[in-house]
């Protein structure tokens, strides 16, 4: 018996200040671009080394990107999205959605010896 | 894992052409950022071509502007590189890369290390 995998999702705020090479992060998504299956949601898809983002750490690869300075990112072309990363400014201030997975033991057997329930 | 295989290098006379081609394993090619390199015996892996998902915005070293040509077909996840009026001075290995999902920082993804995937590369020899 498998176990199951449940995610355990999170919001937080990020305000990172624009660093010499900009935000360092890629992302991907929108409504003419969806990554993920019936979501056209931005998806935070690469950190760079040494980038702001980075450097701050709290942004993760995965990470859904829901606002930007408080402009709602839903139903945006990717290019779109894009722009208004670009033309954000020097504080930018992120909500973002983190979905951590947590992998479950088989019902029952959970607390009985096995390190992963 | 992205994998990433080209084809289409030789031996060719100066002032002839090539087109390269990069096949990209993976169902979310179409988000790839993909770009050309090339490195010639002791020199640095250089810029020669970029393209952005969609297509819709290339880039280029200023080096090959005019003479090569990049573009790329999502539905055959692959990418390409047009080579014409081909000099001496274009010998070199060819390199392909994909970069996962659009920089919010940089507009012609030049810099390799913006990429995440390369090829093994292929040999264009200029005579």
């Known amino acids: 018996m498998n176990g199951r995998v449940d995610y355990l999702v999170t919001e937080e705020e990020i305000n990172l200040t624009r660093g010499p090479s900009g935000l360092g992060f890629n992302i991907v998504g929108g409504t003419d671009q969806q990554y993920v299956s019936n979501d056209s949601g931005i998806y935070v898809s690469r950190i760079k080394e040494n980038g702001a983002a980075a450097l701050d750490g709290r942004l993760q690869e995965g990470d859904k990107i829901l606002s930007v300075n408080g402009q709602d990112l839903k139903n945006l072309l990717h290019q779109d999205a894009v722009d208004l990363f670009r033309n954000a400014g020097y504080a930018v201030s992120l909500r973002v959605q983190h979905r951590l997975q947590v992998q479950n033991g088989p019902i029952g057997h959970r607390g009985e010896g096995d390190p992963s329930g | 894992d992205v994998q990433l295989v080209e084809s289409g290098g030789g031996l060719v006379q100066a002032g002839g052409s090539l087109r390269l081609s990069c096949a990209a394993s993976?169902?979310?090619?179409?988000?790839?950022?993909m770009g050309w390199f090339r490195q010639a015996p002791g020199k640095e892996r250089e810029f020669v071509a970029a393209i952005n998902w969609s297509g819709g915005s290339t880039n280029y070293a200023d080096s090959v502007k005019g003479r090569f040509t990049i573009s790329r077909d999502n539905a055959k996840n692959t990418v390409y590189l047009q080579m014409n009026s081909l000099k001496p001075e274009d010998t070199a290995v060819y390199y392909c890369?994909?970069?996962?999902?659009?920089?919010?920082?940089?507009?012609?993804?030049?810099?390799?290390?913006?990429?995440?995937?390369w090829g093994q590369g292929t040999q264009v020899t200029v005579s």
């Open positions: 993976g169902r979310t090619f179409s988000t790839y950022a």
């Open positions: 890369a994909a970069a996962i999902g659009s920089s919010v920082d940089s507009y012609d993804h030049s810099d390799p290390l913006e990429y995440d995937y």
